[in-house]
């Protein structure tokens, strides 16, 4: 089952993946597409990077991340309803089986219309816009999506999210990304 | 224009190894976007995709296969292989090569084929 | 792995007639889903991809349309050339499947 991601209209979107270079520069081909992994590729192509470079993108769908230490996180630019669904990450990496396939589901909420108070403002400096856990790959990262919009009742949730990733660090072993050679 | 030609012996012994080369012309085998694929077919029955190797180097077999198939590509020669072990007669069939490739715009897969090779298994 | 189901396993009808092909799938393909023509002795043939856009140089007269588990390919008036077998294929999951044939023929 797909991990579930959300944004509100207008904002930008995150969506991660993550893998670590055997070595510095030496990159494996990645991509990003609209609708769950295929056999193939990626259905729908939003952008793909190869060895070297990011060679294809289009309007709107950019890596924000430094994709050559293998950050290659997508974000989706003023986002609309209509880009709700399914996305698929797929780290094409050398060898028998080896590809590593994320379907990870972004919901669109409307925009809310009311003015967010300074005192949420001020919370979004304190804490950062992604909350990660060192858990199963990309699947375990949530975005927190436009911070100023967070109520009271959210920051306690905040904060419990905050303790429970500082206790899957220490409960899981595993990295949070792909980890190749 | 991709053109592919499977090349090989027809009459393989039980319990040997079947060894088929595909021979690309008209593009690199290297070149991005191409995942080469060996289908084959039963006398008088259905496809069955035995494997794949991407132009990345990723490559996936077919579980029922996997414990007896090896897929490699050699640049130099611009040829991929496909290599089955301890064969028998069940693994009678035409071998087809071929390619998808996925068009950086588009995504669309263009499929290439090769013309078959008939792989009988006797003794 | 993914069965794909094909009917009916004959289908026998005159040129100029309109043919409908289906195939299920034992689990959700989305649309990853393409429908191959193979005449005898040849190579078989991609029509359609990704359930309903139609491969380069393949005529009007073949559409496909489907998603998820059941898909279909119709065939609006049939030319002399088109009697052969039809199989579907999805590349949803791997291992790629094939359905067993819909074989259509001149009645």
């Known amino acids: 089952s797909e991990v579930e991601y959300r944004a509100e209209v207008g904002q930008n979107a995150y969506l991660p993946c993550f893998y670590t270079p055997a070595a510095p520069g030496n990159l494996v081909p990645v991509c990003w597409g609209k609708g769950a992994c295929p056999v193939f590729e990626c259905g729908n192509v939003v952008l793909r990077t190869d060895e070297r470079d990011v060679n294809y993108w289009t309007s709107r769908y950019w890596l924000n991340g430094d994709f050559r230490k293998g950050d290659v996180s997508l974000t989706i630019e003023n986002v609309t309803l209509a880009d709700s669904g399914i996305y698929c990450c797929r780290i094409q990496i050398p060898g028998i089986m080896n590809d590593e396939k994320f379907n990870l589901k972004l919901v669109i909420k409307p925009a809310k219309v009311t003015p967010a108070p300074t005192r949420q403002r001020d919370f979004t400096a304190a804490f950062p816009r992604m909350l990660t856990t060192r858990g199963h790959g990309p699947a375990e990262t949530q975005t927190l999506g436009s911070l100023p919009d967070i109520n009271l009742t959210q920051i306690s949730t905040l904060a419990n999210e905050l303790r429970d990733s500082r206790l899957a660090n220490d409960l899981r072993d595993s990295g949070a990304t792909i980890r190749i050679g | 224009q991709v053109t592919l030609k499977e090349s090989g012996p027809g009459l393989v012994k039980p319990s040997q190894t079947l060894s088929l080369t595909c021979t690309v012309s008209?593009?690199?085998?290297?070149?991005?976007?191409?995942?080469w694929s060996w289908i084959r077919q039963h006398p008088g029955k259905g496809l069955e995709w035995i494997g794949y190797i991407s132009y990345s180097g990723s490559t996936y077999y077919n579980p029922s296969l996997k414990s007896r198939l090896t897929i490699s590509v050699d640049t130099s020669k611009n040829q991929f292989s496909l290599k089955l072990s301890s064969v028998t007669a069940a693994d009678t069939a035409v071998y087809y090569c071929a390619t998808a490739y996925y068009d950086i715009l588009t995504g669309y897969p263009f499929d290439y084929w090769g013309q078959g090779t008939l792989v009988t298994v006797s003794s | 792995e993914i069965v794909m189901t094909q009917s009916p396993a004959t289908l026998s009808l005159s040129p100029g007639e309109r043919a409908t092909l289906s195939c299920r799938a034992s689990?959700?393909?989305?649309?990853?889903l393409a429908w191959y023509q193979q005449k005898p002795g040849q190579a078989p043939r991609l029509l359609i991809y990704?359930?309903?856009d139609r491969a380069t140089g393949i005529p009007a007269r073949f559409s496909g349309s489907g998603s998820g588990t059941d898909f279909t390919l119709t065939i609006s008036s049939l030319e002399p050339e088109d009697f052969a077998v039809y199989y579907c294929q999805q590349r949803s999951n791997w291992p790629i499947t094939f359905g067993q044939g819909t074989r259509l023929e001149i009645k």
């Open positions: 990704d359930a309903s």
């Open positions: 689990q959700s393909v989305s649309s990853y």
């Open positions: 008209g593009g690199s085998i290297s070149s991005g976007g191409h995942y």
